[in-house]
Interface confidence: low
Amino acid sequence: EEELQVIQPDKSVLVAAGETATLRCTATSLIPVGPIQWFRGAGPGRELIYNQKEGHFPRVTTVSDLTKRNNMDFSIRIGNITPADAGTYYCVKFRKGSPDDVEFKSGAGTELSVRAKPSAPVVSGPAARATPQHTVSFTCESHGFSPRDITLKWFKNGNELSDFQTNVDPVGESVSYSIHSTAKVVLTREDVHSQVICEVAHVTLQGDPLRGTANLSETIRVPPTLEVTQQPVRAENQVNVTCQVRKFYPQRLQLTWLENGNVSRTETASTVTENKDGTYNWMSWLLVNVSAHRDDVKLTCQVEHDGQPAVSKSHDLKVSAHPKEQGSNTAAENTGSNERNIY
């Protein structure tokens, strides 16, 4: 009679993490009598996966009833596969011996590859805010995927970016892999509403890539532009001077009025108007009693935005044309508009 052969028909099996792997094995003969065992790996360090005769293997079930005398199907199923289960599995036939069973014939092996989904990409930006025209770096990380092949793309508002570097670790064989990418993004004044998106495509995702996002509103600082104007006289001896603070982000802003270099009033931006691009506008006014001044007045609007060095704009108020009266102290108010501008 022809000698028994152990046949493992599948050279390789690819299984998604969490699913069940079926490892097929058949024998060509019932003789010799003896148990079957499954191992991962070969040689002295091989790991026992299933022993027909003894042991407890909760994740393993047999495809057929191995206690049937004429059974020649020794296929097994391994449940809840993880990347750590990857490797080459051998179906080994033993023949009855005394005191121990003796290894008789091994199958050629089936390589189990585990497809593990990458974790949701995590995008992180710079620790400090940057202003338009500056280049900032964003990092994207995703872990735990297998096989190693993976595609990572960067987008800004749906437009693909090209300036980035990506590494997949480790370089050698591993049960699972990680990807790390750094993209450089040039900020523009319109980026308050912008998003940077890291998109990861992998065989396990069936064409539906994972995305991680970062809002540039957390990264950008748009410095304000200032304009100081003198309004028509509201009442005799009173001049209204306004300071328009335009196109700034974030909202954190403190404004100080100075009269001839002396602090007149300090206020914090409250009722701002929002532009379409996400930046803010704000206006503060100062009511100056010109009769309190003998000489021309230099009015300065000084703005400290988001903890940055102050910027200022000055306006020379001519008082010579106004009657000189003994007057009251300088009065000041501020106003905000509820209109929503979208530039």
Epitope: N157, G158, H193, Q195, K276, E339, R340, N341, I342, Y343
Partner: antibody
Framework: QVQLVESGGGVVQPGRSLRLSCAAS????????MHWVRQAPGKGLEWVAV????????YYADSVKGRFTISRDNSKNTLYLQMNSLRAEDTAVYYC???????????????WGQGTTVTVSS | DIQMTQSPSSLSASVGDRVTITCQAS??????LNWYQQKPGKAPKLLIY???NLETGVPSRFSGSGSGTDFTFTISSLQPEDIATYYC?????????FGGGTKVEIK
Amino acid sequence: QVQLVESGGGVVQPGRSLRLSCAASGFTFSSYGMHWVRQAPGKGLEWVAVISYDGSNKYYADSVKGRFTISRDNSKNTLYLQMNSLRAEDTAVYYCAKEPRSYWHGYGMDVWGQGTTVTVSS
Amino acid sequence: DIQMTQSPSSLSASVGDRVTITCQASQDISNYLNWYQQKPGKAPKLLIYDASNLETGVPSRFSGSGSGTDFTFTISSLQPEDIATYYCQQLSNYPITFGGGTKVEIK
């Protein structure tokens, strides 16, 4: 092809509620801002509301603010308009419409549904 | 809110005529203006975006111009299928507002 189909219109009494739906197909719904626009019988177009691609930003016309709520379910490719405290002046054909650019809103409406009629009458 | 004043409210012209519609914004809206065509019983259709850009698939006889507060929409040679109501729309501020519409008819 890109398609928007509104539903949920009908006759309703003043003060009651109605929910309109807009089923989207033929494009990546989750990437686009969406609008509701209405048109009273024999009148012009009136913008009602917009919602950003991810639902995080919503804007409304003053005439519906506090009464109407725009929402979306990206898993179902569906846009909604919940209309409460309905008034006779809300009687109109309601259209849903798609923004032309992904991830943004405020560029207009390049694809419109066929409209669903809402009649508020006692 | 920004008011959009469209004129004329209706017009009648012959096939082949040049038709011009104007739209005036109550404040500066830069070029954030679209033009739509609505045929009776149908949904509106985007023709021009950002004041002067022709939407894909729209015939070249339609054009738009303007910036700031004054805008013009032109049909260079009126065709029978152009019978419709035309609307301008500003997108500079929320709430978005439309012009009152211009009904175009054939003489």
